[in-house]
Amino acid sequence: MAVTACQGLGFVVSLIGIAGIIAATCMDQWSTQDLYNNPVTAVFNYQGLWRSCVRESSGFTECRGYFTLLGLPAMLQAVRALMIVGIVLGAIGLLVSIFALKCIRIGSMEDSAKANMTLTSGIMFIVSGLCAIAGVSVFANMLVTNFWMSTANMYTGMGGMVQTVQTRYTFGAALFVGWVAGGLTLIGGVMMCIACRGLAPEETNYKAVSYHASGHSVAYKPGGFKASTGFGSNTKNKKIYDGGARTEDEVQSYPSKHDYV
C-alpha cells in the first residue's frame, strides 16, 4: 500500500511539475521591467523566451516574436534548450510512469518490469527537474548581471544635456513558476525512485531447510506448518501462503502484509 501511495504521489507531483515547466516555458514574463527607483513610465516591458511584450497605459499590449535564431544571445538559446529538454524528458517520463503504476494492470507485467519502469521514469523526472531549475537559474543569473550593468550606467547622455533612461529588467513570474515546477518534478522523481525500491524483487533471508526422512523427502518451511511432498512435484516458484514463509526463488512485493490488491 505504501509503495502504491508513494508511486502515485510521485506521479501526481511530477505531473504538476511538468505542467508547470511547460507553463513557465510558454510564459512571456521571464523578465519584467524594474519599476523600483525608475522614472514612472507609461509602458511596461516584459520578455519571455520566445517573444517580448509591451503593455501600454492605454490598455494595448503588443508582443513581438524573436524571429531570428542566429541573432539571439547564446545564453537565451541555452535556456530554451534546457527547458525543451526538460519538457521532453518529463513527457517521456510521464508516459513510462503511467505503465509503471502499480494500480494499473497491463497484461501479465511482472513487478520487476514495473520496478524498472518506475526507476526509469523517476530518473527522467529528476533530470527534467534539474534541466528546468538549471534553465531558470541561468536566465536569472543573466538578469542579475544585466541589472547591475545597466544600474552602473543607467543615465547616459551627451554632456549631461540629454538623458537616456536604460530599461532595467528584474525577475518575472515565469522564473518563480519554473523554480517551483522544477523542484516539484525533482521531488516527484525522487519519490518514484523510492517507490521503485519497494517494487523491486529482493532475495529473501528465509532459506528453506530440508530434512531428509527415510521414506520420502519432506521440505519443512520455517514459520509454517504446511509441507509439500518431494515426489516429482516442483516446489520451486510455488507460492505457499503460510503467514510469511516464502520459497527460495519467490518474487514477492514488499511489504506483502499491506498490499490489498
Partner: antibody, heavy 118, light 113 residues
C-alpha cells in the same frame, strides 16, 4: 462612433469644489485607459490625470496632486474628476480623452469650462 | 519631468508650400522594449478640441491626410506638412507619451501668409 461628453463645469469660488463627469459611448469603456487634459484660456494643453482601464494605475500632474481625484465607473461608462481646493490657475477648459495606440489621446470630448473666480 | 521644446512657436506658411515643426525632448522617448518612440503630434483647429495626427513618432492615425508625416527618434522629432492647405491652420502640439507626467510642448501656431 466614439463619443465623449463632459459635464459638470461652471463658475466656482477659490477653495471650492467641483465634480466633472465624462460619459463615454461607442467603445468598450472598460478596455481603455482614460485621461483628463486642460487648456487655460489662450494657453497650451496641460495633462491633468490618467486612470487605467481597471483603475489599478492612477497618475496626476504635480500641479493637481492632493487636490484632484480621478475615478471611473465602468458599469456606467463614466469617467470622473473630483476637484477640491480650487485655485484661480485651475480655470480652464477640461477635456476628457480616451487613450489609443502609443498611449496617444486618440479621442477627445468637446470640453467643459471651469472658471475659478471670486 | 520631461521638458518638450517646440520650434518655431509661430509658423507663417504660403498655401501649397511645405511646413516643418521641430520638437525636442529632454530625455529619449525611445522605448527599448519595442524600439518605438513614444511621441505624439496633435492638431488643434481654432475653437475645436485637439485631434490626434501622429503616434509612435511616425505612425499616422487613420483618417489623417498623407501630407502629414512624422519623423525622428530618441529626442529629436519633426512634423512635416508636404503642402499646406487652408484647413491646416491651428496649433500643433507634440507630447511625451513615455514618462509621467505626460508633458506637452508649448505649441506651434501655423498660419497662412
Amino acid at each position: 462612433e466614439v463619443q465623449l461628453l463632459e459635464s459638470g463645469g461652471g463658475l466656482v469660488q477659490p477653495g471650492g469644489s467641483l465634480r466633472l463627469s465624462c460619459a463615454a459611448s461607442g467603445f468598450g469603456f472598460s478596455d481603455y485607459g482614460m485621461a483628463w487634459v486642460r487648456q487655460a484660456p489662450g494657453k497650451g494643453l496641460e495633462w491633468v490625470s490618467f486612470i487605467s482601464n481597471s483603475a489599478y494605475s492612477i497618475y496626476y500632474a504635480d500641479t493637481v496632486t492632493g487636490r484632484f481625484t480621478i475615478s471611473r465607473d465602468n458599469s456606467k461608462n463614466t469617467l470622473y474628476l473630483q476637484m477640491n481646493s480650487l485655485r484661480a490657475e485651475d480655470t480652464a477648459v477640461y477635456y476628457c480623452a480616451r487613450l489609443g495606440r502609443g498611449n496617444s489621446f486618440a479621442y477627445w470630448g468637446q470640453g467643459t469650462l471651469v472658471t475659478v473666480s471670486s | 519631468d520631461i521638458v518638450m521644446t517646440q520650434s518655431p512657436l509661430s509658423l507663417p506658411v504660403t498655401l501649397g508650400q511645405p511646413a516643418s515643426i521641430s520638437c525636442k525632448s529632454s530625455q529619449s522617448l525611445l522605448n527599448s522594449g519595442n524600439q518605438k518612440n513614444y511621441l505624439t503630434w496633435y492638431q488643434q483647429r481654432p475653437g475645436q478640441s485637439p485631434r490626434l495626427l501622429i503616434y509612435w513618432g511616425s505612425t499616422r492615425e487613420s483618417g489623417v491626410p498623407d501630407r502629414f508625416s512624422g519623423s525622428g527618434s530618441g529626442t529629436d522629432f519633426t512634423l512635416k506638412i508636404s503642402r499646406v492647405e487652408a484647413e491646416d491652420v491651428g496649433v500643433y502640439y507634440c507630447q511625451n507619451e513615455l514618462f509621467y507626467p505626460l508633458t506637452f510642448g508649448q505649441g506651434t501656431k501655423l498660419e497662412i501668409k
